[in-house]
């Protein structure tokens, strides 16, 4: 019973995070404009990985793709790169532990099978969201790092008569996103992982079994020899399943296009 | 076609208050931001800021804060402007405009006349 | 606030002639994020409204006859009447509208010799 729902669960949190991971890496805001300390301008500049925008206080929004793949940092190919991997891999663990989940049989898959692949899918749950935070994090350092090179450019470049607007990026949504869902993807796969030790079958009872006479009561009456074998049957557990109703929130709410700054 | 309609002129006394509006019509009233111009006789534009008809927020022009007050109207499709304490040095043409891509205004309405004269 | 400041206050043309109508900012008016400049250039006729004729600084609104033409980035911008009709003779306005307050120009005023 524990074990199922250790399963069951490890699959709904790993597939609220893969989702979230999803909605992370299509986001448009991992980097948005710092508005704090900064003239307030009718413009408001956001970034994701795949484009960047532009949001007039009009409300009309333009967003540009990068057309480009040679143009673009090193860094965010990378972030592009770490966040595809879980994304793939955190499907196929999705398709994996389908098949391993203990309320579902498929023919007569023995529970051996059950185990390694609920094992599998819960280390590629593991790897994904590793590979998540992993973007995520490499995102924010590099956020972190431009930061405050504008801000030391803020500062330095005063000297000059025609003063410039600074762009400054801090954290957008889609990062905040990424870190949960990764983290729960995570801790899906680690419930997925113990999950498998309760799945596997005990061969060791089989195989480990010492035979030897502590618990025998051997009697030596005038009416013969009478041995009384202590070995009891070996009976397993039988598990029942239950198989809850489980919600799943909108993971974004995207900003209207009357949101202004 | 778009129009905006603003009310007609207005004589005031000082240290008196004026409502004028600005009926929006031939496109949708909460799409778009209305912004409001003060334009004093023979001189330029100044802006004296926005109301955004969607969420009702306003944004001021530190100048006129505390003596404009930009509301709007979803029903009617209007935006109105009140202004307070008024001075000799308010009276002007005072025009509404719907704010458009690249933060333009696009469309204006005819401008309500203030004089304020005792 | 940023100080838009147009040049020359009054110009005297005659029909057909190009024109030039120069505003600087006090500020750079470049958003790095679309690469576009956000200043708009109006035209004012005695007893009427302001009508736009460009914005992005060098975007022509619909219906704006093509002899003007906007141009410049960052803080220097020009207003180009390439030429001019007896019913080009107006005020021509520059604004920013990129940094609140939004701010306007003093205004060129465009006379007939």
């Known amino acids: 019973m524990a074990v199922t729902a250790c399963q069951g669960l490890g699959f709904v949190v790993s597939l609220i995070g893969i989702a979230g991971i999803i909605a992370a890496t299509c986001m448009d805001q991992w980097s948005t404009q710092d508005l704090y300390n900064n003239p307030v301008t009718a413009v408001f500049n956001y970034q994701g990985l795949w484009r960047s925008c532009v949001r007039e206080s009009s409300g009309f929004t333009e967003c540009r793709g990068y057309f480009t793949l040679l143009g673009l940092p090193a860094m965010l190919q990378a972030v592009r790169a770490l966040m595809i991997v879980g994304i793939v891999l955190g499907a196929i663990g999705l398709l994996v532990s389908i098949f391993a989940l203990k309320c579902i049989r498929i023919g007569s898959m023995e529970d051996s099978a059950k185990a390694n692949m609920t094992l599998t899918s819960g280390i590629m749950f593991i790897v994904s969201g590793l590979c998540a935070i992993a973007g995520v994090s490499v995102f924010a350092n590099m956020l972190v790092t431009n930061f405050w090179m504008s801000t030391a450019n803020m500062y330095t470049g005063m000297g000059g008569m025609v003063q410039t607007v600074q762009t400054r990026y801090t954290f957008g949504a889609a990062l905040f996103v990424g870190w949960v869902a990764g983290g729960l993807t995570l801790i899906g796969g680690v419930m997925m992982c113990i999950a498998c030790r309760g799945l596997a079958p005990e061969e060791t009872n089989y195989k480990a079994v010492s035979y030897h006479a502590s618990g025998h009561s051997v009697a030596y009456k005038p009416g013969g020899f009478k041995a009384s074998t202590g070995f009891g049957s070996n009976t397993k557990n039988k598990k029942t399943y239950d198989g809850g109703a489980h919600t799943e929130d909108e993971l974004q709410s995207y900003p209207s296009k009357h949101d202004y700054v | 076609e778009v129009q905006l309609q603003q009310s007609g002129p207005e004589l005031v006394k000082p240290g008196a208050s004026v409502k004028m509006s600005c009926k929006a019509s031939?496109?949708?009233?909460?799409?778009?931001?209305i912004h409001w111009v003060k334009q004093k006789p023979g001189q330029g534009l100044e802006w004296i800021g926005y109301?955004?008809?969607?969420?009702?927020?306003?944004k001021y022009n530190e100048k006129f804060k505390g003596r404009a007050t930009l509301t709007s109207d979803k029903s009617s499709s209007t935006a109105y402007m009140e202004f307070s304490s008024l001075t000799s040095e308010d009276s002007a043409v005072y025009y509404c405009?719907?704010?458009?891509?690249?933060?333009?205004?696009?469309?204006w309405g005819q401008g309500t006349s203030v004089t304020v004269s005792s | 606030d940023i100080v838009m400041t147009q040049s020359p206050s009054s110009l005297t043309v005659t029909v057909r002639e190009k024109v030039t109508l120069s505003c600087k900012s006090s500020?750079?008016?470049?958003?790095?994020?679309?690469?576009?400049?956000?200043l708009t250039w109006y035209q004012q006729k005695p007893g009427q409204p302001p009508k736009l004729l460009i914005y992005?600084?060098?975007t022509r609104e619909s219906g704006v006859p093509d002899r003007f033409t906007g141009s410049g980035s960052g803080t220097d911008f020009t207003l180009t009447i390439s030429s001019v009709q007896a019913e080009d003779l107006a005020v021509y306005y520059c604004?920013?509208?990129?940094?609140?307050?939004?701010?306007f120009g003093a205004g060129t005023k465009l006379e007939l010799k």
């Open positions: 405009a719907r704010l458009n891509r690249g933060n333009a205004m696009d469309y």
């Open positions: 604004q920013n509208v990129y940094i609140y307050p939004f701010t």
């Open positions: 031939g496109y949708t009233f909460t799409n778009y931001i």
């Open positions: 992005w600084a060098s």
């Open positions: 500020q750079s008016l470049l958003n790095s994020g679309n690469q576009k400049n956000y």
């Open positions: 109301i955004n008809p969607y969420t009702d927020g306003p």
